[in-house]
Structure formats: structure tokens, C-alpha cells
């Protein structure tokens, strides 16, 4: 079959790294530098993937495969193949148009990517809050108040102590 | 956007030399292939050339008459086209691709063309 292949088409001997060149009776040319062929039988080299400012090199391009590029620190991938690179943001904030922002009283984000998410409702699971929620982290949610056996102590944090001179509401 | 403005044509006596330009504006030529193609009236579209980090490629037809080269500090790519013949009348356009020889490629990009004619 590959005889057969390569008396019906020359290009089909061309390997990886080169390309076949109809305007040279379909010899094979080797790519020049900064392009590449992953497969044989290629009229063309593909022009390798060129990671610039804030773009940084992972793996340099070859003659057989393209170059692949991560982002520099305080950015993150994005993107198949990383095609674009956004801005970190801290834990406990997401990005906004406007630049990194705190996470709104209820959400939280506990990457330096991404969007705030809301606290886990524990109380829909018929549970309590066990550990309060904060801007990095989520609520932990505690066994229900009916599973706990009797004499049992509380899991519910206990309420904070009132300012002297303010009165109960 | 990228916009690709083609110069330097115009008439020019058989045997005589021409040397077209191809800036591009909104993108460098950094990351792409350049290549040159014309079009006769009446006739296909015929591959002339491309550039590619220091490397160029030709069309069959033009006998190591025409030369690519590149100007990396003006962002310009040339066609050094010498001992012009009546045959070589035609749109001469520029184009960018990812692609490295055009010949059998579809640009990415073209310019509008620019004119050359050789007569007498």
C-alpha cells in the first residue's frame, strides 16, 4: 500500500520536517527555521507560534512540531493551547474591567482566578454552619442540629459579644 | 485590522528593473510568511514568491529574475523584479500567511495590488 501510495503521490514520501514542492517536481524541502511540519506529505511548513511579551516560551518550536507558550508570572492561561494570558488576581478577589476586586460580603474565591462565588447555603442541605464563610474560602457546613446527640455541644459558633451601652435589638 | 498597501509599479521597457514594496500597517510581518502574487488580465492568478526567515521560495516561471527580501526596521517586504519581460504585465499583490511556501495556499491577508507594465 505505501509503494502504491508513493507511485500515485511523491508527496507522501516527504517526512515530518519538510514539505513537498510542487515547484521543484515535488521534491522534499526541508522547512527553513522557524516553521515546522508535524506529519509527512505536507505542501506547506506551518510558521511556528512566536510567545511574546507576555506570552513565554514552554517549549521551543521545531522542525516537527510548533512551539508552545505559558504566561509570565501574574498571569494565568487562557484559551486552548493558552492562546491568551489574563492577569492574577489575589485570593479573595476576582477581576473585574476595572482591575482585581473583592469579593462582594457572601462570595468568595479561593484562586488567583476566576469569578467570586457564592457561599455555600448549608441550610438547604438542612445542615448549620459549622466554620463562618470569608473572601478566600467557603463556609464549612456542620452535621444538622437534629443529628447531634444529646448533651452535645453546639456547633454553632457562638454569638459575639454586644459593645457595652448597645442594647439587645 | 490588518492592511497591506503594495507600491512601486508602474511602466517599465523590456529588460528594465522594478522593485515593488509591501508595508503593512496594524500587524508586523513578524509572525507571518509574505508572498507575492499576480494576476494578468484575463488570466489566473500565479504565484510568484515567499519569505520566511531568511528563506525565500519562487514560483517556476520566473528563472531567478525576481528576488524577496525584507526590511525587519521598516516592517517592508520587496520584490526586486530584473530584465522585465511583456509577459510579466500584470497586478502584482502582496499577502501574508502561516503558511511557508503560498503556492498552494489561500492568504490570510492581501493588499489591493499594484500595477506593472512592460512595453515598449
Known amino acids: 500500500f505505501e509503494r502504491t501510495r508513493s507511485l500515485q503521490d511523491p508527496c507522501s514520501n516527504c517526512p515530518a520536517g519538510t514539505f513537498c514542492d510542487n515547484n521543484r517536481n515535488q521534491i522534499c524541502s526541508p522547512c527553513p527555521p522557524n516553521s515546522f511540519s508535524s506529519a509527512g506529505g505536507q505542501r506547506t511548513c506551518d510558521i511556528c507560534r512566536q510567545c511574546k511579551g507576555v506570552f513565554r516560551t514552554r517549549k521551543e518550536c521545531s522542525s516537527t512540531s510548533n512551539a508552545e507558550c505559558d504566561c509570565t508570572p501574574g498571569f494565568h492561561c487562557l484559551g486552548a493551547g493558552c492562546s491568551m494570558c489574563e492577569q492574577d488576581c489575589k485570593q479573595g478577589q476576582e477581576l473585574t474591567k476595572k482591575g482585581c476586586k473583592d469579593c462582594c460580603f457572601g462570595t468568595f474565591n479561593d484562586q488567583k482566578r476566576g469569578i467570586c462565588r457564592p457561599w455555600t447555603n448549608c441550610s438547604l442541605d438542612g445542615k448549620s454552619v459549622l466554620v463562618n464563610g470569608t473572601k478566600e474560602r467557603d463556609v464549612v457546613c456542620g452535621p444538622s442540629p437534629a443529628d447531634l446527640s444529646p448533651g452535645a455541644s453546639s456547633v454553632t459558633p457562638p454569638a459575639p459579644a454586644r459593645e457595652p451601652g448597645h442594647s439587645p435589638q | 485590522e490588518v492592511q497591506l498597501v503594495e507600491s512601486g509599479g508602474g511602466l517599465v521597457q523590456p529588460g528594465g528593473s522594478l522593485r515593488l514594496s509591501c508595508a503593512a500597517s496594524?500587524?508586523?510581518?513578524?509572525?507571518?510568511?509574505v508572498g507575492w502574487f499576480r494576476q494578468a488580465p484575463g488570466k489566473e492568478r500565479e504565484y510568484v514568491g515567499t519569505?520566511?526567515?531568511?528563506?525565500?521560495h519562487y514560483g517556476d516561471f520566473e528563472k531567478g529574475r525576481f528576488t524577496i527580501s525584507r526590511d525587519n526596521s521598516k516592517n517592508t517586504v520587496y520584490l526586486q523584479m530584473n530584465n522585465l519581460r511583456p509577459e510579466d504585465t500584470a497586478v502584482y499583490y502582496c499577502?501574508?500567511?502561516?503558511?511557508?511556501?503560498?503556492?498552494?495556499?489561500?492568504?490570510?491577508?492581501q493588499g489591493q495590488g499594484t500595477q506593472v507594465t512592460v512595453s515598449s
Open positions: 519569505y520566511w526567515s531568511g528563506y525565500a
Open positions: 496594524g500587524r508586523t510581518f513578524d509572525n507571518y510568511a
Open positions: 499577502a501574508i500567511s502561516l503558511k511557508y511556501p503560498m503556492a498552494t495556499v489561500t492568504p490570510d491577508y
